[in-house]
Amino acid sequence: LMGGQDKPFLSARPSTVVPRGGHVALQCHYRRGFNNFMLYKEDRSHVPIFHGRIFQESFIMGPVTPAHAGTYRCRGSRPHSLTGWSAPSNPLVIMVTGNHRKPSLLAHPGPLLKSGETVILQCWSDVMFEHFFLHREGISEDPSRLVGQIHDGVSKANFSIGPLMPVLAGTYRCYGSVPHSPYQLSAPSDPLDIVITGLYEKPSLSAQPGPTVQAGENVTLSCSSWSSYDIYHLSREGEAHERRLRAVPKVNRTFQADFPLGPATHGGTYRCFGSFRALPCVWSNSSDPLLVSVTGNPSSSWPSPTEPSSKSGICRHLH
């Protein structure tokens, strides 16, 4: 990982993918330590700041511009050698985002998947991107790259992720790049949370006052388990969004969340899942489905939830 005998290892924190105007720390690790180092950019553009300068432990680059995008190498200090410097490090590609309109990102068959399944993340745009990049939040490695396929005025790429395991759950974004500027990426797509289910024991789901209610009667769905889940997620069949609530410890040593659905107007099939704060995108097995039936005059839709849900944000902590 740290390069050869006389070769330093250049890395970027927090990521090699940097938003325009952002900052990134470049570290040159040499001979079991972070020594003094020199930095080079392969195309030699836009780096007067490097010329003849020696950096200590890390180099903080920014606010970055499109001209910062490119391939970097470092040389570590080697006082007793002929040149005083090591061999060049591994190449490190810095990609700068925010240079073109954002693409769209979709999950097939969907963003909620069982452990072991495979998901296709499709990135597409009406901008004729030559390459698409897929990046998972919090990962410092280079993003996956695919050549864009152009068809009917749309460029797209299908990224296959799987078999799914906890480490692959998280928030994904994709970017596009145009020919001749391969490391100047578009603005990020809207974030897409990939959730893996089936890792822990299922919670139980019940309805108060019961699963069959009169139209207009207030309904609360309770999700509970003996497992010390931090968060419960409630989904309704046919709806893209889930609702989530913090679990509350009860006197009977269970952990429970009560989802108030408000006055009943329309039935539906509900499921709930539990998750832990440390792995917000890794969920339990689904509870048994609960069919809520409404007698009387069912209208076409259930009232909007008391707190709005969003396409993303599942993988962020509940504060």
Epitope: A25, F34, P48, S58, I60, P63, T65
Partner: antibody, heavy 118, light 107 residues
Framework: QIQLVQSGSELKKPGASVKVSCKAS????????MQWVQKSPGQGLEWIGW????????KYAEDFKGRFAFSLDTSVSTAYLQISSLKAEDTAVYFC???????????WGQGTTVTVSS | DIVMTQSHKFLSASVGDRVTFTCKAS??????VAWYQQKPGQSPKLLIY???TRHTGVPDRFSGSGSGTDYTLTISSVQAEDVAVYYC?????????FGGGTKLEIK
């Protein structure tokens, strides 16, 4: 949004010490550095130096070596400037500003007035 | 140390005028020049860096140009809220140094 909030004004006697704090929010503290700039009465802006928030390594301008010291508490995203053996000529407004090795200071604190008077 | 000279201490303009601030470096700074705006009672704000890159949220009436030792900041159509002191700064080599500032006044 990115914000740098500095501690309040200080009135000190010559020979005393002062510690100015600069609390950052809205970005990952350790991916940037903190620059410090002095604005003396009737004077322009003068760069004191900066500290790399990733490595903790400070760098000082020649005129500010010795009595000026930078430190960090990354657990609370805060940078500090300490000035010891204060002199009347240290009377100034001190600014912290986010920036790295490239010397561009993209967000600034509101400034802390330090007055040194007997 | 690199000396940055802003020859005009004051500039006066009417609303809607085009105004240009100049800055001269004592040596070639290879386009590593930033411009800051300091309004009365406020801290400086970054406008431009690397000679011509506008900082996030800066109106496009502000633009920068230059190379070698000579750099300019232009406001294409001055607004009343642009009353401030404008500083140039070289970010080519440490110590980073600032010009003495030019105060923009509205007629």
């Amino acid at each position: 949004q990115i914000q740098l909030v500095q501690s309040g004004s200080e009135l000190k006697k010559p020979g005393a010490s002062v510690k100015v704090s600069c609390k950052a929010s809205g970005y990952t503290f350790t991916t940037a550095g903190m620059q410090w700039v002095q604005k003396s009465p009737g004077q322009g802006l003068e760069w004191i130096g900066w500290i790399n928030s990733h490595s903790g390594v400070p760098k000082y301008a020649e005129d500010f070596k010795g009595r000026f010291a930078f430190s960090l508490d990354t657990s609370v995203s805060t940078a500090y400037l300490q000035i010891s053996s204060l002199k009347a000529e240290d009377t100034a407004v001190y600014f912290c500003a986010r920036g790295g090795d490239e010397g561009v200071m993209d967000y600034w604190g509101q400034g802390t007035t330090v007055t040194v008077s007997s | 140390d690199i000396v940055m000279t802003q020859s005009h201490k004051f500039l006066s303009a009417s609303v809607g005028d085009r105004v240009t601030f100049t800055c001269k470096a004592s040596q070639d700074v290879s386009t590593a020049v930033a411009w800051y705006q300091q309004k009365p009672g406020q801290s400086p704000k970054l406008l431009i860096y690397w000679t011509s890159t506008r900082h996030t949220g800066v109106p496009d009436r502000f633009s920068g140009s230059g190379s070698g030792t000579d750099y300019t900041l232009t406001i294409s159509s001055v607004q009343a809220e642009d009353v401030a002191v404008y500083y140039c700064q070289q970010h080519y080599s440490t110590p980073w140094t600032f010009g003495g500032g030019t105060k923009l006044e509205i007629k």
